[in-house]
């Protein structure tokens, strides 16, 4: 009889206790493989769940979450409330990310900003609640004449980092000194 059971197709169940062994799954139940002893009750997508795929006699229903919620777990076994970017879900609801952390999604937790200095880099763009910091070239890469594999930083808003201001000031000073000595040297030649 075991061999006969394997002849029962998906959408039926198998009963060894009688000669006619295959029975159709009752409404709202399914068997996704042949030879099953029972049909499984169809999943019902209720409450915060909505139906993504209807149940059939050979496959279970599939659920999604309603608007404002997102799936968690295998086969969307749970729905969790969405938060805004820059927030995380706590037991008391959605809370803003603390200073020094960010969340760029509607789900998950706030994560610390990247520490650029650990990689020997400088902060190019400050972090926010919604966005991580953007690390720029290392201070060594900013010295004059040094070649760098780091691509040029995109144009950005005012509020430059101290390293860039220092570099610009230094460059300006050197250029001014060079000009000053060139002028002096030119005047000396004139006097002769």
């Amino acid at each position: 009889l075991q061999d006969l059971c394997s002849n029962c197709p998906a959408g039926t169940f198998c009963d060894n206790n009688r000669s006619q062994i295959c029975s159709p799954c009752p409404p709202n139940s399914f068997s996704s493989a042949g030879g099953q002893r029972t049909c499984d009750i169809c999943r019902q997508c209720k409450g915060v769940f909505k139906t993504r795929k209807e149940c059939s006699s050979t496959s279970n229903a599939e659920c999604d979450c309603i608007s404002g919620y997102h799936c968690l777990g295998a086969e969307c076994s749970m729905c969790e409330q969405d938060c805004k970017q820059g927030q995380e879900l706590t037991k008391k609801g959605c809370k803003d990310c603390c200073f020094g952390t960010f969340n760029d999604q509607k789900r998950g937790i706030c994560r610390p900003w990247t520490n650029c200095s650990l990689d020997g880099k400088s902060v190019l763009v400050n972090g926010t609640k919604e966005r991580d910091v953007v690390c720029g070239p290392s201070p060594a890469d900013l010295s004059p004449g040094a070649s760098s594999a780091t691509p040029p930083a995109p144009a950005r808003e005012p509020g430059h980092s101290p390293q860039i201001i220092f570099f610009l000031a230094l460059t300006s000073t050197v250029v001014l000194f060079l000009l000053f000595f060139l002028v002096l040297d030119y005047k000396d030649d004139d006097d002769k």
Epitope: T12, C22, S57, T58
Partner: antibody, heavy 114, light 107 residues
Framework: EVQLVESGGGLVKPGGSRKLSCAAS????????MHWVRQAPDKGLKWVAY????????YYADTVKGRFTISRDNAKNTLFLQMTSLRSEDTAMYYC???????WGQGTTLTVSS | NIVMTQSPKSMSMSVGERVTLSCKAS??????VSWYQQKPEKSPKLLIY???NRYTGVPDRFTGSGSATDFTLTISSVQAEDLADYHC?????????FGAGTKLELK
């Protein structure tokens, strides 16, 4: 909305042949087994045949075995019943139904008479 | 083959009355019994499956009960629109079999 629409019925002489069709919509046809059930005038319902979702398993009522052939075209969402060697007792309204037997078509009438 | 026997063959009721229809199986069919309503010139509609589960959209005045060989469909307060034939059927084994039906008429 689930819909099952039978067609192909009509008047046939005894010994003749006919092919019934059942067009399915509103559900994933390829995931359901399908039945044909008939009802003679002023009589009860009689199950005729079953085909599994993929077409690999087929059952027939003893009264139609060897004369009727159930088949399906999942690409076209259509169920068929090829009937041969028809008899007067095959006169009935023929319904198709999903294997859950929860939705039935409106039926198509077959009359076998000389 | 499993034989399903329905009784009575017909019954006349007044609106608001309680109706009990019977269906007996010739052998144990567990709870694999369904009840169908068929109005004149229409196809059958599923009311109850698994002996006692009301199908989607079916009014709660319809109740199914029973197991093994004895099954009952109860209409707690019959309405004019319930005028129809009622069929029981078993899906415990092939061939699927149905009762001859009970005709419900209104007085």
């Amino acid at each position: 909305e689930v819909q099952l629409v039978e067609s192909g019925g009509g008047l046939v002489k005894p010994g003749g042949s006919r092919k019934l069709s059942c067009a399915a919509s509103g559900f994933t046809f390829s995931e359901f087994g399908m039945h044909w059930v008939r009802q003679a005038p002023d009589k009860g319902l009689k199950w005729v045949a079953y085909i599994s979702s993929g077409g690999s398993t087929i059952y027939y009522a003893d009264t139609v075995k060897g004369r009727f052939t159930i088949s399906r075209d999942n690409a076209k969402n259509t169920l068929f019943l090829q009937m041969t060697s028809l008899r007067s007792e095959d006169t009935a309204m023929y319904y198709c139904a999903r294997d859950w037997v929860d939705y039935w078509g409106q039926g198509t009438t077959l009359t076998v008479s000389s | 083959n499993i034989v399903m026997t329905q009784s009575p063959k017909s019954m006349s009721m007044s609106v608001g009355e309680r109706v009990t229809l019977s269906c007996k199986a010739s052998e144990n069919v567990g709870s694999y019994v369904s009840w169908y309503q068929q109005k004149p010139e229409k196809s059958p509609k599923l009311l109850i499956y698994g002996a006692s589960n009301r199908y989607t959209g079916v009014p709660d005045r319809f109740t199914g009960s029973g197991s093994a060989t004895d099954f009952t469909l109860t209409i707690s307060s019959v309405q004019a629109e319930d005028l129809a034939d009622y069929h029981c059927g078993q899906s415990y084994s092939y061939p699927l079999t149905f009762g001859a039906g009970t005709k419900l008429e209104l007085k």
